[in-house]
């Protein structure tokens, strides 16, 4: 039961995380105009990965897409790439994990196959989360650098008397969404990897023998000899007897061919 719960929870957490990564990638507020210690403007500027927007005091909002590809900063391109890789890996991970869920039965899929799929999706979620966190962090670092650069020359003189105010940008909501979402995807991936360990079939050090004494239909299964689960373990090497000492996760709804000798 614990393994199923861990797997299910890992899937749900990753699903929320990936939805968050997608939302963050699409959001326009990656960087927002810094309002602190700045002249009060009648406009509010904010920028995303794909377009920049201006909200006027009337509420009128105008957005312009970045229609150039080569003219964009390399860092922005890198952030875009990291976020897209994160989304793609996460989406594939979700697809794989759906089939890996213990509560879903697909044909006669072996537990070891589900364990492998769970591990694969878990790794994909971890990498997806790391990509998102890296992407958001790179963008945040870019903002911090630009912020202090623009603070150093906040007012750049133009022809002596005339001044132009440089717009400073600070962290937008999308950065926080991205960090949280990346973290959730990462946690979900770790949970899937943990669940994978419990999903793989157990291998005991020796074959248990069933003795049918009169009045007893349950054989004693020695404990404490759990072999370390190999993710690519030989599925033909099955337990001869599976009676009595099952964990809740191992209970099957129909009799196994190994239930009786």
């Amino acid at each position: 039961m614990a393994v199923t719960a861990c797997q299910g929870l890992g899937f749900v957490v990753s699903l929320i995380g990936i939805a968050g990564i997608i939302a963050a990638t699409c959001m326009d507020q990656w960087s927002t105009q810094d309002l602190y210690n700045n002249p009060v403007t009648a406009v509010f500027n904010y920028q995303g990965l794909w377009r920049s927007c201006v909200r006027e005091s009337s509420g009128f909002t105008e957005c312009r897409g970045y229609f150039t590809l080569l003219g964009l900063p390399a860092m922005l391109q890198a952030v875009r790439a990291l976020m897209i890789v994160g989304i793609v890996l996460g989406a594939i991970g979700l697809l794989v994990s759906i089939f890996a869920l213990k509560c879903i039965r697909i044909g006669s899929m072996e537990d070891s196959a589900k364990a492998n799929m769970t591990l694969t999706s878990g790794i994909m979620f971890i990498v997806s989360g790391l990509c998102a966190i890296a992407g958001v962090s790179v963008f945040a670092n870019m903002l911090v650098t630009n912020f202090w650069m623009s603070t150093a020359n906040m007012y750049t003189g133009m022809g002596g008397m005339v001044q132009t105010v440089q717009t400073r940008y600070t962290f937008g909501a999308a950065l926080f969404v991205g960090w949280v979402a990346g973290g959730l995807t990462l946690i979900g991936g770790v949970m899937m990897c943990i669940a994978c360990r419990g999903l793989a079939p157990e291998e005991t050090n020796y074959k248990a023998v069933s003795y049918h004494a009169s009045g007893h239909s349950v054989a004693y299964k020695p404990g404490g000899f759990k072999a370390s689960t190999g993710f690519g373990s030989n599925t033909k090497n099955k337990k001869i007897y599976d009676g009595g000492a099952r964990t809740e996760d191992e209970v099957q709804s129909y009799p196994s061919k190994h239930d009786y000798v």
Epitope: T41, A42, N45, V54, S57, E62, M158, V162, T164
Partner: antibody, heavy 120, light 113 residues
Framework: EVQLVESGGGLVQPGGSLRLSCAAS????????IHWVRQAPGKGLEWVAY????????YYADTVKGRFTMSRDNAKNSLYLQMTSLRAEDTAVYYC?????????????WGQGTTVTVSS | DIVMTQSPDSLAVSLGERATISCKSS????????????LAWYQQKPGQPPKLLIY???TRASGVPDRFSGSGSGTDFTLTISSLQAEDVAIYHC?????????FGQGTKLEIK
């Protein structure tokens, strides 16, 4: 037809108070920010205050900050400017003007104005 | 505060001739976010409230004749009346629409020569 009608002007002594009103019609009042602008006799235009659609943002000119209070009642399509501690330099024609929606913050419609005279 | 300086203070132009009014701001009115200029021009006839002519430095407001045009960017702006008509006699004001407090120029009085 968009209409803005100011009222409440008059003669007041220095240090006195006055409340100006602006009645709006012909448009959805709650969708627009409104400005107060004044013009002293023979002088140029001077922006006084601005209130956003939902009253969440109110800005004042430094010359009136702490003395004037701007408010609005969207249910009554009305705008108010409460003026206290009035000075001789506040003597002017006061206009309420609508902040245009897509006019780069410019004021697209103006009322006819109401005259405020501060004199002893 | 942004200081708006108009020149000349008054201008006399013959009917049918071109009239040009200049406006300079102490800071750039070009918003970096959308590369748009936040400057408006108003026309005020005697005894009347101002009327919006131009916004965004160059866009004519609805109902404004096409003889009125606005140009310029950053700190230097111009209002041009290509062919002066009798009804254009008025005071013209430029206004900073980017920074609070919103500020106006001192006004330019346009008369017929």
């Amino acid at each position: 037809e968009v209409q803005l009608v100011e009222s409440g002007g008059g003669l007041v002594q220095p240090g006195g108070s006055l409340r100006l009103s602006c009645a709006a019609s012909g448009f959805t009042f709650s969708d627009y920010g409104i400005h107060w602008v004044r013009q002293a006799p023979g002088k140029g235009l001077e922006w006084v205050a601005y209130i956003s659609r939902g009253s969440s943002t109110i800005y004042y000119a430094d010359t009136v900050k702490g003395r004037f209070t701007m408010s609005r009642d969207n249910a009554k399509n009305s705008l108010y400017l409460q003026m206290t501690s009035l000075r001789a330099e506040d003597t002017a024609v006061y206009y309420c003007a609508r902040g245009g929606y897509d006019t780069r913050n410019a004021m697209d419609y103006w009322g006819q104005g109401t005259t405020v005279t501060v004199s002893s | 505060d942004i200081v708006m300086t108009q020149s000349p203070d008054s201008l006399a132009v013959s009917l049918g001739e071109r009239a040009t009014i200049s406006c300079k701001s102490s800071q750039s009115l070009l918003n970096s976010g959308n590369q748009k200029n936040y400057l408006a021009w108003y026309q005020q006839k005697p005894g009347q409230p101002p009327k919006l002519l131009i916004y965004g430095a160059s866009t004519r407001a609805s109902g404004v004749p096409d003889r009125f045009s606005g140009s310029g960017s950053g700190t230097d702006f111009t209002l041009t009346i290509s062919s002066l008509q009798a009804e254009d006699v008025a005071i013209y004001h430029c206004q900073n629409d980017l920074y609070y407090p919103l500020t106006f120029g001192q006004g330019t009085k346009l008369e017929i020569k």
